[in-house]
């Protein structure tokens, strides 16, 4: 006959308050004759949780039918778990005897601990926007989890990031823990549509991690490039000048025209288009009346983007019969 082994497969069982916990125990032999009992703790002060032989245990039920002879499963379910139920539970075989049954063999024990799921991660970006090629910091926070062991990863557009620092508090024993992680992300010009993701994995989540996201569109400022051009064809006594503001983000933009240093209100038309990468283009047309115009007309397109210092581009207007020659220069 095979020597009796008491098998408790789980070293740790995480349970949630109010739920039912299943403590597993199987035996490899039915000998010696005698009952199987469950205890919490060890030594003289151990607490009887379930006795196959006798007693009333209203919160405990057996997983299998213990009246079946070939049953080797002595697992139990404990309902309505409370924080007072935490501890290490032992499945113990006794040999029938008098005046008391004699403890024969104990299982290795299963530690029951209260598991608390982490809160949904909250990702916060920088307070101010930053231009591409610079580094910005994102923080991720999740709270209220237990046990302390937790895994946090950062991703940018699905690619795992490595430049981050993570802290779990408190360092000592606690009912619940918090995690805070700061990731450093280098901004690319095309990051308007990018996302950073903070992923938290915890034993209570059963392999289904929680994710928090932040859009880099909240953190990036892509400054515009300006180009001012004179249209080659005259329309009567008017010349059409175009200011093209390209690849900027966010959309917030103020454009003003100046003629020989004097601010004009005569913007004829403008269009805003969105690029595939999420940046914008703005095109403004300005009609210059050249009927009484001298040769030295300088037009300036000035753009103030997202509250930053204005940038401008100048164009010296060439009024010739064929309007072939165009020249321009930029001033910051």
């Amino acid at each position: 006959e095979e020597e009796l082994q008491m098998i408790q497969p789980e070293k740790l069982l995480l349970v949630t308050v109010g739920k039912t916990a299943t403590l597993h125990c199987t035996v490899t032999s039915l000998l010696p004759v005698g009952p199987v009992l469950w205890f919490r703790g060890v030594g003289p002060g151990r607490e009887l949780i379930y006795n196959q032989k006798e007693g009333h245990f209203p919160r405990v039920t057996t997983v299998s039918d213990l009246t079946k002879r070939n049953n080797m499963d002595f697992s139990i379910r404990i309902s309505s778990i409370t924080p007072a139920d935490v501890g290490t539970y032992y499945c113990v075989k006794f040999r029938k005897g008098s005046p008391e049954d004699v403890e024969f063999k104990s299982g290795p024990g299963t530690e029951m601990a209260l598991g608390a799921k982490p809160s949904a991660p909250v990702v916060l970006g920088p307070a101010a926007r930053t231009t591409p090629e610079h580094t910005v910091s994102f923080t991720c926070e999740s709270h209220g989890f237990s046990p302390r062991d937790i895994t946090l990863k950062w991703f940018k557009n699905g690619n795992e990031l490595s430049d981050f620092q993570t802290n779990v508090d408190p360092t000592g024993q606690s009912v619940a823990y918090s995690i805070r992680s700061t990731a450093r992300v280098v901004l690319d010009p095309w990051d308007v549509r990018s996302q950073v993701i903070c992923e938290v994995a915890h034993v209570t989540l059963q392999g289904d991690p929680l994710r928090g996201t932040a859009n880099l569109s909240e953190a990036i400022r892509v400054p515009p490039t300006l180009e001012v051009t004179q249209q080659p064809m005259r329309v009567g006594n008017q010349v059409n000048v175009t200011c093209q503001v390209r690849k900027f983000y966010p959309q917030s933009l103020q454009l003003t025209w100046s003629e020989n240093g004097n601010v004009c209100q005569r913007e004829t038309a403008s269009t805003l288009t969105e690029n595939k990468d999420g940046t914008y283009n703005w095109t403004s047309w300005f009609l210059v009346n050249i009927s009484d115009q001298r040769d030295d007309v300088v037009l300036t397109c000035q753009v103030k983007h997202d509250g930053q210092l204005a940038v401008s581009k100048r164009l010296a207007l060439e009024v010739t019969v064929h309007q072939k020659d165009q020249s321009s220069d930029a001033t910051p």
Epitope: N70, K96, P99
Partner: antibody, heavy 118, light 107 residues
Framework: EVQLVESGGGLVQPGGSLRLSCAAS????????MHWVRQATGKGLEWVSA???????YYTGSVKGRFTISRENAKNSLYLQMNSLRAGDTAVYYC????????????WGQGTMVTVSS | DIQMTQSPSSLSASVGDRVTITCRAS??????LAWFQQKPGKAPKSLIY???SLHSGVPSKFSGSGSGTDFTLTISSLQPEDFATYYC?????????FGQGTKLEIK
Amino acid sequence: EVQLVESGGGLVQPGGSLRLSCAASGFTLSSYDMHWVRQATGKGLEWVSAIGTAGDTYYTGSVKGRFTISRENAKNSLYLQMNSLRAGDTAVYYCVRGGVWDDAFDIWGQGTMVTVSS
Amino acid sequence: DIQMTQSPSSLSASVGDRVTITCRASQDINNYLAWFQQKPGKAPKSLIYTASSLHSGVPSKFSGSGSGTDFTLTISSLQPEDFATYYCQQYVSYPYTFGQGTKLEIK
């Protein structure tokens, strides 16, 4: 249905032998401790012998060396070989199944009568 | 061997009565005590094991108690089918031994 049916009883002379059989149905006999209990006419119950699941055997003092308990798993049957029978062995012999974890008797056969008389 | 002593040896009672039979072991048997009911010409029937646990199908009017050396069987309200002989048995160690029986008769 769980059932035990004894057979093999009868009249035998003192010093003679008998082999009692117990056919089990509805369960696997080898998974249980099995017992023989006897009852003389008008008397109380007396435990006679047992065989454990591991094949270990036990006897009451008055039958030790004379009776042998055994089982045949293929036939799901229990036996009691009784030799050197005495008048004091006259009784109804019951085949009894021991309980699941503590060996408390739970299923009894209907009994078979053994009479030892010249 | 462990000696089992039942009392009384016989008992007369009426239908509806509550009766108690006691069983004493010569040494501590923990709670490995069983009770059986036997009617004339029939095999015994298992009623109670581990002193107080009812076998499947046994009506709840039967109850057992005790531990160590002193045990009782109580029948809460006697019915005609309950008049029989009752035996206690210790099964903590071999040889298993029975009490001499208590015959419950109709008054």
